[in-house]
């Protein structure tokens, strides 16, 4: 019993004056607490507690369940304890079969003994199975058996407390260990779609999937730059041990333009946090934006191919697309396809393939597209470059030589005189008159140019060359002169 110097408060004294007491089942337990400032007796075993305000604790017929720690406390808060074992051969263990352990921590199998004199107090696997090789434990007859550093692999381990009594092994009722996993990584979070585009009034619904080892992972939807609590619904599943999945679904039943923004799904556990975002854009109505992938003014050489290509954004999805030329709709030669196979794709491509274009096929080619909200169009002006063609070369009644040529771009006509019969003409002759004839005609056809020179300027036999040329090529026509005396004869035009 404790001894202290006079004047200082001292703990109560207990009779019998020993730390442990063994009584047989059915016998009397009589404990006396002596202290001038006695307050109470407290009894504890497992999670059970009982109190007694009388200084003598008497249990007339002891039962195994009376095994436990009896503590006497005085008014100074000082206490003294005695542990009583009630030996019952039919009930060697008191048990609370609740058995939970946190990974990497110790956990107590609560099977205190009613008889401290039995031997080989230990743990055994159920149905004769061995315990895991790395399982370490420390027995304590007054508390139970402490499993050290619980492993995840011990989850659902079935075991018994065991003692040897008179040479025989006696087992307690079975315990099943449930292991709470330690978080050793951040949660895994993913979102159903990275971006959403909606019209006003449509429903916005997005699901965040959170995966972790246990359900105690925390998760929430947040709106960036806002503290407003969002309404979310949960579904969750345990896919076997330590494989937990939660789906947190955020819904805005009728989205408005000012709901646009970035929404974050945030999850954390004791190891750390993770997040994923999705972007919502709400528009008051649908739209179509067209982007030409080549210049809308196109120059192409006669007989060559050209592809007219547009990209366009359409929301909602495009419903009708067409390419038109001269009020005529193309039924083939074009294709229209989404820019990506992504579910949230709003970008598309349309291509019109024009092959072996003729000079007569220049003009305006128009792409039209529509959805349920809007129509849009874009026009391409296609010019076909053609080598000049000499349409007429004549000597007029007034003695003028006239050359008419057509082509695109607009041909230039030059005149040359070749003395004798040479056809390599070098001396240039200035025209008297040059006119572009078809300025009132179709804007994309060939351009016709007329040029005239005065034949009276030529005094010798020879050849006059009319040469029409542009960026694409050149063409010539010739006039032959023959003089008899003072008279000009036989003006033979030829190309």
């Amino acid at each position: 019993q404790p001894s202290v110097s006079p004047g200082e408060p001292s703990p109560p004294s207990i009779h019998p004056g020993k730390s442990d007491l063994i009584v047989r089942v059915g016998d009397e337990i009589r404990l006396l607490c002596t202290d001038p400032g006695f307050v109470k007796w407290t009894f504890e075993i497992l999670d059970e507690t009982n109190e007694n305000k009388q200084n003598e604790w008497i249990t007339e017929k002891a039962e195994a369940t009376n095994t436990g720690k009896y503590t006497c406390t005085n008014k100074h808060g000082l206490s003294n304890s005695i542990y009583v074992f009630v030996r019952d051969p039919a009930k060697l263990f008191l048990v609370d079969r609740s058995l939970y352990g946190k990974e990497d921590n110790d956990t107590l199998v609560r099977c205190p003994l009613t008889d401290p004199e039995v031997t080989n107090y230990s743990l055994k696997g159920c149905q004769g199975k061995p315990l895991p090789k790395d399982l370490r434990f420390i027995p304590d007859p007054k508390a139970g058996i402490m499993i050290k550093s619980v492993k995840r692999a011990y989850h659902r381990l079935c075991l018994h407390c065991s003692v040897d009594q008179e040479g025989k092994s006696v087992l307690s009722e079975k315990f099943i260990l449930k292991v709470r996993p330690a978080f050793k990584a951040v949660p895994v979070v993913s979102v159903s779609k990275a971006s959403y585009l909606l019209r006003e009034g449509e429903e916005f619904t997005v699901t965040c999937t959170i995966k972790d080892v246990s359900s105690s992972v925390y998760s929430t939807w947040k709106r960036e730059n806002s503290q407003t609590k969002l309404q979310e619904k949960y579904n969750s599943w345990h896919h076997g041990d330590f494989n937990y999945e939660r789906q947190a679904t955020l819904t805005i039943s009728s989205a408005r333009v000012n709901d646009s923004g970035v929404f974050m799904c945030y999850a954390n556990n004791t190891f750390g946090s993770a997040n994923v975002t999705t972007t919502l854009e709400v528009v008051d109505k649908g739209f179509i934006n067209i982007f030409p992938m080549i210049n809308t003014t196109v120059f192409v050489n006669d007989g060559e191919n050209v592809d007219l290509i547009v990209e366009y954004e359409a929301f909602p999805k495009p419903e009708h697309q067409q390419w038109i030329y001269m009020n005529r709709t193309f039924t083939d030669k074009w294709e229209d396809y989404p820019k990506s196979e992504n579910e949230s794709n709003i970008r598309y491509v349309s291509e019109l393939h024009l092959t072996r274009l003729k000079g007569t096929e220049g003009g305006t080619y128009t792409f039209l597209v529509s959805n349920s909200d809007v129509n849009a169009a874009i026009a391409f002006n296609v010019y076909v470059n053609t080598k000049p063609e000499i349409l007429t070369y004549d000597r007029l009644v007034n003695g003028m030589l006239q050359c008419v040529a057509a082509g695109f771009p607009e041909p230039t006509i030059d005149w040359y005189f070749c003395p004798g019969t040479e056809q390599r003409c070098s001396a240039s002759v200035l025209p008297v008159d040059v006119q572009t004839l078809n300025s009132s005609g179709p804007p994309f056809g060939k351009l016709v140019v007329q040029s005239s020179i005065d034949s009276s300027a030529f005094k010798h036999n020879g050849t006059v060359e009319c040469k029409a040329y542009n960026d694409v090529g050149k063409t010539s026509a010739y006039f032959n002169f023959a003089f008899k005396g003072n008279n000009k004869e036989q003006i033979h035009p030829h190309t």
Epitope: E48, S98, K178
Partner: nanobody, 123 residues
Framework: EVQLLESGGGLVQPGGSLRLSCAAS????????MSWVRQAPGKGLEWVSA????????YYADSVKGRFTISRDNSKNTLYLQMNSLRAEDTAVYYC????????????????RGQGTLVTVSS
């Protein structure tokens, strides 16, 4: 075969009371601390209350403290939950279960759990 059979659920107005019972068969409940847990529509399991093997120690979730009382009668192998001052947010299926994790977490299993009884709090 172990069975835990809950009863006593039903429709009650806010502010009203109910007493849930859980009768065990094929199992001696005195060998277990016992718990009540609940699951509200669309939510996960939530631990409500627990009681030690002999009944002298009781534990409650903050959301029910002062309104719910857990008790047991080991001689009848029965667990009880007295629910007073009920609120709409108490609407759930209530389950009795063997075991209690003294760290206050429910994390993936009881040795045994009943089929549940539905409590609906609505005006």
């Amino acid at each position: 075969e172990v069975q835990l059979l809950e009863s006593g659920g039903g429709l009650v107005q806010p502010g009203g009371s109910l007493r849930l019972s859980c009768a065990a068969s094929g199992l001696t409940i005195s060998t277990y601390a016992m718990s009540w847990v609940r699951q509200a529509p669309g939510k996960g399991l939530e631990w409500v209350s627990a009681i030690s093997t002999g009944g002298s120690s009781t534990y409650y979730a903050d959301s029910v403290k002062g309104r719910f009382t857990i008790s047991r009668d080991n001689s009848k192998n029965t667990l009880y939950l007295q629910m007073n001052s009920l609120r709409a947010e108490d609407t759930a299926v209530y389950y009795c279960a063997t075991g209690y994790d003294s760290s206050g977490h429910y994390y993936g299993g009881f040795d045994y759990r009943g089929q549940g009884t539905l409590v609906t709090v609505s005006s």
